[in-house]
Interface confidence: medium
C-alpha cells in the first residue's frame, strides 16, 4: 500500500513483499526490504522512535537508497503497520503485518496494565475499544461489568476489526465500570487487557499558558511551557501543541490531570512541553490546543531565544533629567538584555539604597526631590550569566524657584525714623539664578485698611497697583544698587539692595525675583515714624534666662499715652505674595503689656522689663504713642530675638602629636555654646599655668608652647564650660630627643 502525494519525478519506495496485508506465524523472522530513489527510513509498531533493540535496519549490500528491516522471533505484539518513507517527505509505502500468536491473540498495550475508553452518553455516538488482534479472523465478543453483560458483533452497529478494535454504541456500555474483549480459539478463552470506562462531558472553560508572556531564553537552556485546561466534570482532554521547530530532538510532552478540591465542579488538565536545550529555530509562537472532542480551545505565547546572554542600554535612556524642588522624579533604567540584568544605582560614586525618600530599582524614584539630590547618577547593569557590565550616567539638575531669605528673618512690620537713610535688602536664592529682580512701591495710605473695614489676613492690603521704583513721585527718593553675588551659608545668592535716601513717607516696597521655574516676592512695610524710638537694654540679642528691657522714648511735648503691646500670633501664616497688616490700624491683634514710666527733662520713657527671657518671649513688640494735638496714633515695632541656651561643644579634635625638643607646638580649641563657654587648659589633669614658654591667646582658644622641653610631654586637655556644663577634648604630646644641659648645670 502506498501513502502520500507523488512528488515530481520521485517514485514511491518499493517493498520486497508486494502486499497490503501479510500474515505470519509467531516466532518466525520478519524481513522486508525497501528500495527507493533517495534516503529512506522505516517506522514500525509500538516503537516510533527507532531505538527498539529487537528491530534491525540495515543498508542493503546491493544498492544505494535501500534498507532492510529484520525482526527475528516475532511475537503478537509486532502486529501492525510497517512504513518505509523518504526522509522529510510524506511519500511512503505501508504493509500491515499480522503475527498469528494463538497464545496472545490480542496485541498487548505498550505500557499499561489497563486502558481507558472515554464515552459520551449520546445515542448516536459509537466508541471503539482498541483491542487489536494479531489474527484477523477471530470470533470476538465484548464483556462489560458490573453487572456482567456480553456483546457480540451483530453485523450492524456492533463489530470487531483486528486493525481497529471493538466498535459499539457508547450508551450501551455507559453503565459499566470496565470492559474487555474476549476471543475463543479451540474452546480456549483469551482476554484483552481491561479498559476502564470513563463517561465524559465536553465543555472547556479556559486554556491558560504559563508563563503567559515575555518568555526569553538563551541557546542551550530548557524551555518549560505548562498548558492548563479547566473543564466541567467528566471531560477527557486531548492536548495538541504547535511550535516552530516540530522536529526537535529534545522535545518532551507530559500530560496529566491535576487534583481539584473535593466537591469542585471543575476538572483541571495539564500538558507540559519541555525542550531541554533550545536553539534559535525554537524561537516563535507556541500554541496549545485542548480538545474534548466536541469543543476546542487554544492559547498562544511567543518564545524569544537569544544567541547568548547580553545586556545593553535602550535607546530611550536619558542623560539629563531636569526637575523642580518638591517634584517626584522617575529615572527608568531602560535596557535590552537577557536574562534581566541586576541593576545598581550610584550617586556621585556612592551606592544608593532604597528608603522612604528614594526607591532604587528598575526605576530610580526620588519621592520629593530636593536641591541636595542634584548630581550625577550612575546606573550599572550586570548580566547575571556573562557578568558583563554596562554603565550609564544620568545628570539630575534640580531647579529651585526664587526664595527670598529675609522673608523668614525680619519682622514684616519694622518702623523707621523720619529722615533717616535706610537700605532694604532682598537676598535671593534660586537655581538657575534669577534672570531679574525688580523693585516696586506703593504709599502706605493707598493700601491700608480703614479702621472700619474688617481685616483680612489673606489680603490685608486692598491695593493692587504697584509702581516701579524708577517712578518715585510722591514717595521716598530711591536708588537701586546693582545686584551683587554672595556666598552665604555655602550657597550662591543674589543680593539686591534698595537705598532710601531719606525716610519721609510710609510706603510698602516689594522685591520680585523670577527664574525659569517660578517667582518669589517679599513685601516690606516701610513705616516711617516721627514718633517714639525703641531701644533694648542691655543687649540686642538676649539669651534665654537673661533679663532684658525694652525702652520706648518719646518727646513729652508732642506725645502722650505711651503703651507697650506685643503683636499676637497671626491667625494664619502670611503666605507668599501676601502683605503685612499695618499695625496701628489694627489693634485687635495686639496684647497690652505692663510697663513702668520714667521721665526726664524732655522725654517720657516707658520701660517694659522681661525677667528670665524665654523663647516664648520672642516676637514683635509695639510701642504706641498718641499725638497730643491731632490724637493720631504712632506705632513703632521692634522684633525681639531670644537666643536659645546651648551647652558647650568643641568643634574639631585635638590630635596626638610628636615634637622634637626645642620646637614649638601650636594648637587651637574652638568652642561654641550659649552663653559662650570659658576655655581652660589642663596638663596631666592639672590646670595649665601661663609662663614664658606657655602662651594662651584669643580667650584661651589658642595654646602655644614655645621651645618645648621633655617635661612638656603629657596629656593635654581643653575644657569649655558654661552654666550648662562642660565639654572637653584630649591629646597626648610626645617630646622626642635628649634635653640639652644648661649652663646652670
Amino acid at each position: 500500500a502506498s501513502v502520500g502525494l507523488p512528488s515530481v519525478s520521485l517514485d514511491l519506495p518499493r517493498l520486497s513483499i508486494q502486499k497490503d496485508i501479510l500474515t505470519i506465524k509467531a516466532n518466525t523472522t520478519l524481513q522486508i526490504t525497501c528500495r527507493g530513489q533517495r534516503d529512506l527510513d522505516w517506522l514500525w509498531p509500538n516503537n516510533q522512535s527507532g531505538s527498539e533493540q529487537r528491530v534491525e535496519v540495515t543498508e542493503c549490500s546491493d544498492g544505494l537508497f535501500c534498507k532492510t528491516l529484520t525482526i527475528p522471533k516475532v511475537i503478537g505484539n509486532d502486529t501492525g503497520a510497517y512504513k518505509c518513507f523518504y526522509r522529510e517527505t510524506d511519500l511512503a509505502s505501508v504493509i500491515y503485518v499480522y503475527v498469528q500468536d494463538y497464545r496472545s491473540p490480542f496485541i498487548a498495550s505498550v505500557s499499561d496494565q489497563h486502558g481507558v475508553v472515554y464515552i459520551t452518553e449520546n445515542k448516536n455516538k459509537t466508541v471503539v475499544i482498541p483491542c487489536l488482534g494479531s489474527i484477523s479472523n477471530l470470533n470476538v465478543s465484548l464483556c462489560a461489568r458490573y453487572p456482567e453483560k456480553r456483546f457480540v458483533p451483530d453485523g450492524n452497529r456492533i463489530s470487531w476489526d483486528s486493525k481497529k478494535g471493538f466498535t459499539i454504541p457508547s450508551y450501551m456500555i455507559s453503565y459499566a465500570g470496565m470492559v474487555f474483549c474476549e476471543a475463543k480459539i479451540n474452546d480456549e478463552s483469551y482476554q484483552s487487557i481491561m479498559y476502564i470506562v470513563v463517561v465524559v462531558g465536553y465543555r472547556i472553560y479556559d486554556v491558560v499558558l504559563s508563563p503567559s508572556h515575555g518568555i526569553e531564553l538563551s541557546v542551550g537552556e530548557k524551555l518549560v511551557l505548562n498548558c492548563t485546561a479547566r473543564t466541567e466534570l467528566n471531560v477527557g482532554i486531548d492536548f495538541n501543541w504547535e511550535y516552530p521547530s516540530s522536529k526537535h530532538q529534545h522535545k518532551k510532552l507530559v500530560n496529566r490531570d491535576l487534583k481539584t478540591q473535593s466537591g469542585s465542579e471543575m476538572k483541571k488538565f495539564l500538558s507540559t512541553l519541555t525542550i531541554d536545550g533550545v536553539t534559535r529555530s525554537d524561537q516563535g509562537l507556541y500554541t496549545c490546543a485542548a480538545s474534548s472532542g466536541l469543543m476546542t480551545k487554544k492559547n498562544s505565547t511567543f518564545v524569544r531565544v537569544h544567541e547568548k546572554p547580553f545586556v545593553a542600554f535602550g535607546s530611550g535612556m536619558e542623560s539629563l533629567v531636569e526637575a523642580t524642588v518638591g517634584e517626584r522624579v522617575r529615572i527608568p533604567a531602560k535596557y535590552l538584555g537577557y536574562p534581566p540584568p541586576e541593576i545598581k544605582w550610584y550617586k556621585n560614586g556612592i551606592p544608593l539604597e532604597s528608603n522612604h525618600t528614594i526607591k532604587a530599582g528598575h526605576v530610580l524614584t526620588i519621592m520629593e526631590v530636593s536641591e541636595r539630590d542634584t548630581g550625577n547618577y550612575t546606573v550599572i547593569l550586570t548580566n547575571p550569566i556573562s557578568k558583563e557590565k554596562q554603565s550609564h550616567v544620568v545628570s539630575l539638575v534640580v531647579y529651585v524657584p526664587p526664595q527670598i531669605g529675609e522673608k523668614s528673618l525680619i519682622s514684616p512690620v519694622d518702623s523707621y525714623q523720619y529722615g533717616t537713610t535706610q537700605t532694604l535688602t532682598c537676598t535671593v536664592y534660586a537655581i538657575p539664578p534669577p534672570h531679574h529682580i525688580h523693585w516696586y512701591w506703593q504709599l502706605e495710605e493707598e493700601c491700608a485698611n480703614e479702621p472700619s473695614q474688617a481685616v483680612s489676613v489673606t489680603n490685608p492690603y486692598p491695593c493692587e497697583e504697584w509702581r516701579s521704583v524708577e517712578d518715585f513721585q510722591g514717595g521716598n527718593k530711591i536708588e537701586v544698587n546693582k545686584n551683587q553675588f554672595a556666598l552665604i551659608e555655602g550657597k550662591n545668592k543674589t543680593v539686591s539692595t534698595l537705598v532710601i535716601q531719606a525716610a519721609n513717607v510710609s510706603a510698602l516696597y516689594k522685591c520680585e525675583a523670577v527664574n525659569k521655574v517660578g517667582r518669589g516676592e517679599r513685601v516690606i512695610s516701610f513705616h516711617v515714624t516721627r514718633g517714639p524710638e525703641i531701644t533694648l537694654q542691655p543687649d540686642m540679642q538676649p539669651t534665654e534666662q537673661e533679663s532684658v528691657s525694652l525702652w520706648c522714648t518719646a518727646d513729652r511735648s508732642t506725645f502722650e499715652n505711651l503703651t507697650w503691646y506685643k503683636l499676637g500670633p497671626q491667625p494664619l501664616p502670611i503666605h507668599v505674595g501676601e502683605l503685612p497688616t499695618p499695625v496701628c490700624k489694627n489693634l485687635d491683634t495686639l496684647w497690652k503689656l505692663n510697663a513702668t514710666m520714667f521721665s526726664n527733662s524732655t522725654n517720657d520713657i516707658l520701660i517694659m522689663e522681661l525677667k528670665n527671657a524665654s523663647l516664648q518671649d520672642q516676637g514683635d513688640y509695639v510701642c504706641l504713642a498718641q499725638d497730643r494735638k491731632t490724637k493720631k496714633r504712632h506705632c513703632v515695632v521692634r522684633q525681639l530675638t531670644v537666643l536659645e541656651r546651648v551647652a558647650p561643644t568643641i568643634t574639631g579634635n585635638l590630635e596626638n602629636q610628636t615634637t622634637s625638643i626645642g620646637e614649638s607646638i601650636e594648637v587651637s580649641c574652638t568652642a561654641s555654646g550659649n552663653p559662650p563657654p570659658q576655655i581652660m587648659w589642663f596638663k596631666d589633669n592639672e590646670t595649665l599655668v601661663e609662663d614664658s614658654g606657655i602662651v594662651l591667646k584669643d580667650g584661651n582658644r589658642n595654646l602655644t608652647i614655645r621651645r618645648v622641653r621633655k617635661e612638656d610631654e603629657g596629656l593635654y586637655t581643653c575644657q569649655a564650660c558654661s552654666v550648662l556644663g562642660c565639654a572637653k577634648v584630649e591629646a597626648f604630646f610626645i617630646i622626642e630627643g635628649a634635653q640639652e644641659k644648661t649652663n646652670l648645670e
Epitope: S218, E221, P309, I380, T382, I385, K387, E388, K389
Partner: antibody, heavy 122, light 107 residues
Framework: SLEESGGDLVKPGASLTLTCTAS?????????MCWVRQAPGKGPEWIAC????????PSYASWAKGRFTISKASSTTVTLQMTSLTAADTATYFC????????????????WGPGTLVTVSS | DVVMTQTPFSVSAAVGGTVTINCQAS??????LAWYQQKPGQPPKLLIY???NLASGVPSRFKGSGSGTEYTLTISDLECADATTYYC?????????FGGGTEVVVK
C-alpha cells in the same frame, strides 16, 4: 597563578588581612576575583567576589556582609579584610578566578591558589 | 542566596563502573553550574562549567547535564584516582554557592 598570604594564628576578636597575588595576568573586565574558605572537614564556602573591571560593587555572601571586606589593592593583588574573628572563622582561605566574557556565559572558577590557613584560638 | 542540595552524601562503585551525583538548586540558575573535584590538601579543581562543558584537560569520562534547577555529574569507567570529594557550585548572578559535597569511593 594565584597565591594567598597573610594567614596566621590570631585571638578571638582580632582582625586580619589576607592578600591574593596574581602572576602571569592582571585584573581586567574578563575576570572576577573571589575568596572562598574551607573549614577542616567541611565543604568550600564562598565569601566574596570583586569585578576586575572599573565598575560595580563587590558581592558578598549574606553571612559575610559587615565583617569581611574585599578590595583591589593593585592590578595584581586583591585583599580580604576580616574583623571580629571567632573560632568559627578557622579555615583555609582560597583565592579563585572566575573567567567571564562579554555577552558570553562565565566559565567557572578555573584558577585557584593553594590557600592560606587562618586559625582563631585563645 | 541560592541553596544547593547535593545528593547522595557518599556513593561507591567498582573500578570501571559508573557513579551519578545530583545537585538541585533552590531556584533556576539557568545553566550556570560548575562541578569541582577536590583531593585532600589541594584546592578544588574545575571539571565542568555551564552544566555540561568539559574544562580543559578533563577526561571525557566526566559528563555533566541538566538545566534550570536539576543537574547531574556522571563519572564512567571509574579509576582509583577518582576516589575523592566532588562539589557542585552555582555561579549565576552575584551569588556563588557550593553544594555540600559527595564522597566517591572506588572499590
Amino acid at each position: 597563578s594565584l597565591e594567598e598570604s597573610g594567614g596566621d594564628l590570631v585571638k578571638p576578636g582580632a582582625s586580619l588581612t589576607l592578600t591574593c597575588t596574581a602572576s602571569g595576568f592582571s585584573f581586567s573586565s574578563n575576570y572576577y576575583m573571589c575568596w572562598v574558605r574551607q573549614a577542616p572537614g567541611k565543604g568550600p564556602e564562598w565569601i566574596a567576589c570583586i569585578y576586575g573591571g572599573s565598575i560595580g560593587d563587590p558581592s558578598y555572601a549574606s553571612w559575610a556582609k559587615g565583617r569581611f571586606t574585599i578590595s583591589k589593592a593593585s592590578s595584581t593583588t586583591v585583599t580580604l579584610q576580616m574583623t571580629s574573628l571567632t573560632a568559627a572563622d578557622t579555615a583555609t582561605y582560597f583565592c579563585a578566578r572566575e573567567e567571564v566574557g562579554v555577552s558570553a556565559p562565565s566559565r567557572g572558577w578555573g584558577l585557584w591558589g593553594p590557600g592560606t590557613l587562618v586559625t582563631v584560638s585563645s | 542566596d541560592v541553596v544547593m542540595t547535593q545528593t547522595p552524601f557518599s556513593v561507591s562503585a567498582a573500578v570501571g563502573g559508573t557513579v551519578t551525583i545530583n545537585c538541585q538548586a533552590s531556584e533556576s540558575i539557568y545553566i550556570n553550574l560548575a562541578w569541582y573535584q577536590q583531593k585532600p590538601g589541594q584546592p578544588p579543581k574545575l571539571l565542568i562549567y555551564d552544566a555540561s562543558n568539559l574544562a580543559s584537560g578533563v577526561p571525557s569520562r566526566f559528563k555533566g547535564s541538566g538545566s534550570g534547577t536539576e543537574y547531574t555529574l556522571t563519572i564512567s569507567d571509574l579509576e582509583c584516582a577518582d576516589a575523592t570529594t566532588y562539589y557542585c557550585q552555582n555561579y549565576y548572578g552575584s551569588s556563588y554557592d557550593f553544594g555540600g559535597g559527595t564522597e566517591v569511593v572506588v572499590k
